[in-house]
Interface confidence: medium
């Protein structure tokens, strides 16, 4: 899960595999102030999971979420 510092969530590690796409309802990018670039996926149960924006599956999920 992202770590919040002064209300700015940052990620220090990425999830190791894709969650099923159906479990993800939304996403956001962490701030440019964070040391690691990251996408935060929010699951249907409101769990926040840090993901590596360079991974192909992450980009595909973002495209899918944008279209839905």
């Amino acid at each position: 899960s992202p770590y919040s510092s002064d209300t700015t969530p940052c990620c220090f590690a990425y999830i190791a595999r894709p969650l099923p796409r159906a479990h993800i309802k939304e996403y956001f990018y962490t701030s440019g102030k964070c040391s690691n670039p990251a996408v935060v996926f929010v699951t249907r149960k409101n769990r926040q999971v840090c993901a590596n924006p360079e991974k192909k599956w992450v980009r595909e999920y973002i495209n899918s979420l944008e279209m839905s």
């Epitope: 894709p18 840090c50 192909k56």
Partner: antibody, heavy 123, light 111 residues
């Protein structure tokens, strides 16, 4: 340290069902997916499906759809795999394996496997 | 459907180096992490490489993993071979819905 303890060997007749259990210690079931993998004698590893914590529901490999049911009893931290309409080709060792579903990359993420349960289907 | 293909068997002499390939088809192998398992007869698989190139504690550094995006393949390399390395080796990854995918396995014989 996560550990998995599977139920003992089973011998079943064709057409019957078998239910294999997998008790998890050292990690809550609500945080991990439990995958089921089988290995027929002299063959490779075959993924059957998994029970996902997000929805508390299973996803199955297409070839087992309709014949396999994966469930969990969270109070007992135990996962189950039931395979029905058994045939001789289902004779195999059935493994459960953990998948720390939400975990970040790093050594805490690695899968842990049970020792396997031999299921023999014979008339 | 994403698939992983391995050679059925490889053999090499003690002390030498062997590389086992795992080629992806129907998708990019670099989309997700690759694991490698060693399985000795009568035992459950055990992890020798996780997350493409990471070694669990207890696995010697003569065992290494790598990914080559240009050939869409992963490789497991074992140097300084001993008879202890004789086993079946499986590569493993995921498709886009967290379904596990295994290679067919490679039998390593140390001559």
């Amino acid at each position: 340290q996560v550990q998995l303890v599977q139920s003992g060997a089973e011998v079943e007749k064709p057409g019957a069902s078998v239910k294999v259990s997998c008790r998890v210690s050292g990690y809550p079931l609500t945080e991990i997916a439990i995958h089921w993998v089988r290995q027929a004698p002299g063959k490779g590893l075959e993924w059957m499906g998994s029970f996902e914590p997000e929805d508390a529901e299973a996803i199955y490999a297409q070839r087992f759809q309709g014949r396999v049911t994966m469930t969990e009893e969270t109070s007992a931290n135990t996962a189950y795999m039931e395979l029905s309409s058994l045939r001789s080709e289902d004779t195999a060792v059935y493994f459960c394996a953990t998948d720390p579903y939400y975990a970040s990359s790093g050594s805490n993420y690695m899968e842990v496997w049970g020792r396997g349960t031999l299921v023999t289907v014979s008339s | 459907n994403f698939m992983l293909t391995q050679p059925h068997s490889v053999s090499e002499s003690p002390g030498k180096t062997v590389t086992i390939s795992c080629t992806g088809s129907g998708g990019s192998i670099s989309s997700n992490y690759v694991q490698w398992y060693r399985q000795r007869p009568g035992s459950a698989p055990s992890t020798v490489i996780y997350e493409d190139d990471q070694r669990p504690s207890g696995v010697p550094d003569r065992i290494s993993g790598s990914i080559d995006s240009s050939s869409n393949s992963a490789s497991l390399t074992i140097s300084g071979l001993t008879t202890e390395d004789e086993a079946d080796y499986y590569c493993h990854s995921y498709d886009g819905n967290n379904r596990w995918v295994f290679g067919g396995g490679t039998k390593l014989t140390v001559l």
